[in-house]
């Protein structure tokens, strides 16, 4: 049976050109976390195994950075980037959790309403 | 002047699927996410989902994966959601309403289209 | 799914009364950055809901300065100041922060 829950950083709003750490934690579960992966609409930004590290897909090398931890840190945003993103905990006995995380990406100049955005 | 129309009232027999539609205007359609929220008869609201018009990626409330699609037409600023074989329990309000950015908010609604499902 | 609670179900009022609505949520609503966002709706009977609150205070456009919104974390609350006939109708809160986007039951604003 799958008790585990995945917490995650929460849905973030930030401006262009900037950067952001996605985070997930997963927690009540004595599970074995063998793999996360990292993904966004079916596309696989980065895996991180427990045994073989990190690998970043070719296309994000240039502004996907791993960790801290099994999180990810996206830098240099664009508008593009604007969507939801999976951490997929692969674990053993349990199965699969996963956790998503919406990333909106704002062009400086449209902050509506006086918007708070931080960026590490 | 932010307007989101859309379709008229629909009676439609259990098992089809059908479109409803949301055509923008009065704002950059692609500058800003479109949610889709439901009202069953006399019930609360739920969050089906949203699209970003710029990118075209969506966001489901898991509920509603397989039973709601979510679609845009740039070219005409109109939103679309895909209801799939419908039933009775599909009856309801369905509204579009604009994302507010930077908020996680919906800022402006449609008029809601209802949708009856009934043999 | 993070669920949202809103007290009470039904709140009977007279025009003028000063009335709070409550929202609590099954988990923090902040994100990691430190924003959290809880926002406020009005329902009125044949129409669509409208935006009062976002970002747990912040008005809307047009909205009156009667409605005020507080509260952090877990906690939320609404408040309107002179009750008038045109705020009655059902409020619901909204969770953005985690998906997927979940409202409250609704409360129901109605005269006593």
């Known amino acids: 049976m799958m008790t585990g829950t995945i917490e995650t950083t929460g849905n973030i709003s930030a401006e262009k050109g900037g950067s952001i750490i996605l985070q997930c934690h997963l927690s009540s579960t004595t599970a074995q976390v063998t793999q996360v992966n990292w993904e966004q609409q079916d596309q696989l930004l980065a895996i991180c195994n427990a045994d073989l590290g990190w690998h970043i897909s070719p296309s994000f090398k240039d502004r996907v950075a791993p960790g801290p931890g099994l999180g990810l840190t996206l830098q240099s945003l664009t508008v593009n980037d604007t969507g939801e993103y999976f951490c997929i905990y692969h674990t053993y006995p349990d199965g699969t959790y996963t956790g998503r995380i919406f990333l909106e990406v704002l062009e400086s100049s449209v902050a509506e309403h006086g918007a708070r955005f931080q960026i590490p | 002047e932010v307007q989101l129309q859309q379709s008229g009232p629909e009676l439609v027999k259990p098992g089809v699927s059908m479109k409803i539609s949301c055509k923008a205007s009065?704002?950059?359609?692609?500058?800003?996410?479109m949610n889709w929220v439901r009202q069953s008869h006399g019930k609360d609201l739920e969050w089906i989902g949203l699209?970003?018009?710029?990118?075209?990626?969506?966001s489901y409330n898991q509920k509603f994966k397989g039973k709601a699609t979510i679609t845009v037409d740039k070219a005409s600023s109109t939103a679309y959601m895909d209801l799939l074989s419908l039933t009775s329990e599909d009856s309801a309000v369905y509204y579009c309403?604009?994302?507010?950015?930077?908020?996680?908010?919906?800022?402006?609604w449609g008029q809601g289209t209802s949708v009856t499902v009934s043999s | 799914d993070v669920v949202v609670t809103q007290t009470p179900l039904s709140l009977p009022v007279s025009f003028g009364d000063q009335v709070s609505i409550s929202c609590r949520s099954s988990?923090?609503?902040?994100?990691?950055?430190?924003?959290?966002?809880l926002s406020w709706y009005l329902h009125k009977p044949g129409q669509s809901p409208q935006l009062l609150i976002y970002?747990?205070?912040n008005r809307f456009s047009g909205v009156p300065d009667r409605f005020s919104g507080s509260g952090s974390g877990t906690d939320f609350t609404l408040k309107i100041s002179t009750i008038k006939p045109e705020d009655l109708g059902m409020y619901y809160c909204?969770?953005?922060?985690?998906?997927?986007?979940?409202f409250g039951g609704g409360t129901k604003l109605e005269i006593k």
């Open positions: 699209i970003i018009p710029y990118n075209g990626g969506t």
């Open positions: 009065g704002y950059s359609f692609t500058g800003y996410t």
């Open positions: 909204l969770q953005g922060t985690h998906q997927p986007w979940t």
């Open positions: 988990q923090s609503l902040t994100n990691s950055y430190g924003n959290t966002y």
């Open positions: 970002g747990i205070s």
């Open positions: 309403a604009r994302g507010l950015r930077g908020y996680f908010a919906m800022d402006y």
